[in-house]
């Protein structure tokens, strides 16, 4: 009938409703991990560079002028 | 040729200057190094300086307390040492930048 | 600091044999230049540090062919083939690309 068709209908969107919310809570649930995770890892790469950048100015370059000179001294001599 | 000199007894506190005289290469053309070695011990590169005197660098526990300079003309290179303390005592190397050729070194001992 | 980090510290050899240092550093040693400033020196009793090898495996002048340098990133070798009486000494392996520049504490090579 009519009305059994009708009530089958509302069960069947409510189903659908209550399914589709479950799945995009367990999809918001998922992406969230992996922004978390991306986070974690940007947040573990960035520390990683800033240690990297500190230790760079921590452990300065030798001025080029401090450097092995194009032309070795004993050649100098020798020549 | 690196001949160094200046090395002696000083008490803590105290200051002395050492020389270096070079030969037989174009000293003006070369960047300096002062190197020390604790008797008996490893190496430590104590300062450098350029060609012309203009740039210079240090190890941190020397930093305001020594001076590194040059006089081309005399093919000279110094190190003025103050504020001495027991911990700078060791023998004094001039080398050549690159670490190509030492002097025979001096030696400075900080003690009262 | 970088820290160099020599083996074995004491190494005796066979007159004819050959003998392997190395010397690993606690970063990588290249400069923005793009050279490696890497170094290996002997110091002979009584005597001043000599340097065998430049810039990783240029030989020095003067040194003989059975000494070779070898290496990249953070671990270097110096190797010598054939070895004589006189190469007994304590090797030191040191670096120049960042301040300060710093050294090995050696190792002691004895003739058995």
């Known amino acids: 009938s009519e009305a059994e068709d009708a009530s089958l209908l509302s069960f069947m969107q409510g189903y659908m409703k209550h399914a589709t919310k479950t799945a995009k809570d367990a999809l918001s649930s998922v992406q969230e991990s992996q922004v978390a995770q991306q986070a974690r890892g940007w947040v573990t790469d960035g520390f990683s560079s800033l240690k990297d950048y500190w230790s760079t100015v921590k452990d300065k370059f030798s001025e080029f002028w401090d450097l092995d000179p194009e032309v070795r001294p004993t050649s100098a001599v020798a020549a | 040729q690196l001949v160094e000199s200046g090395g002696g007894l000083v008490q803590p506190g105290g200051s002395l200057r050492l020389s270096c005289a070079a030969s037989?290469?174009?000293?003006?053309?070369?960047?300096m190094r002062w190197v020390r070695q604790v008797p008996g011990k490893g190496l430590e590169w104590v300062s450098s300086?350029?060609?012309?005197?203009?740039?210079?660098a240090y190890r941190d526990s020397v930093k305001g307390r020594f001076t590194i300079s040059r006089d081309n003309a005399k093919n000279t290179l110094y190190l003025q040492m103050n504020s001495l303390r027991a911990e700078d005592t060791a023998i004094y190397y001039c080398?050549?930048?690159?670490?190509?050729?030492w002097g025979q070194g001096t030696l400075v001992t900080v003690s009262s | 600091d970088i820290v160099m980090t020599q083996s074995p510290l004491s190494l005796p050899v066979t007159p004819g044999e050959s003998a392997s240092i190395s010397c690993k550093t606690s970063?990588?040693?290249?400069?923005?230049?793009?050279?490696?400033?890497f170094y290996w020196f002997l110091q002979k009793p009584g005597q001043s540090p000599q340097q065998l090898i430049y810039?990783?495996?240029n030989r020095a002048s003067g040194v003989p062919d059975r000494f070779s340098g070898s290496g990249s990133g953070t671990d270097f070798t110096l190797k010598i083939s054939r070895v004589k009486a006189e190469d007994a000494g304590v090797y030191y392996c040191?670096?120049?690309?960042?301040?300060?520049?710093?050294f090995g504490q050696g190792t002691r090579l004895e003739i058995k």
């Open positions: 037989g290469f174009t000293f003006g053309t070369y960047s």
């Open positions: 300086i350029h060609t012309e005197g203009g740039g210079t």
């Open positions: 040191a670096h120049g690309t960042y301040y300060p520049h710093t």
């Open positions: 810039q990783v495996s």
């Open positions: 970063q990588g040693l290249v400069h923005s230049d793009g050279k490696t400033y």
């Open positions: 080398v050549i930048a690159g670490y190509s050729d």
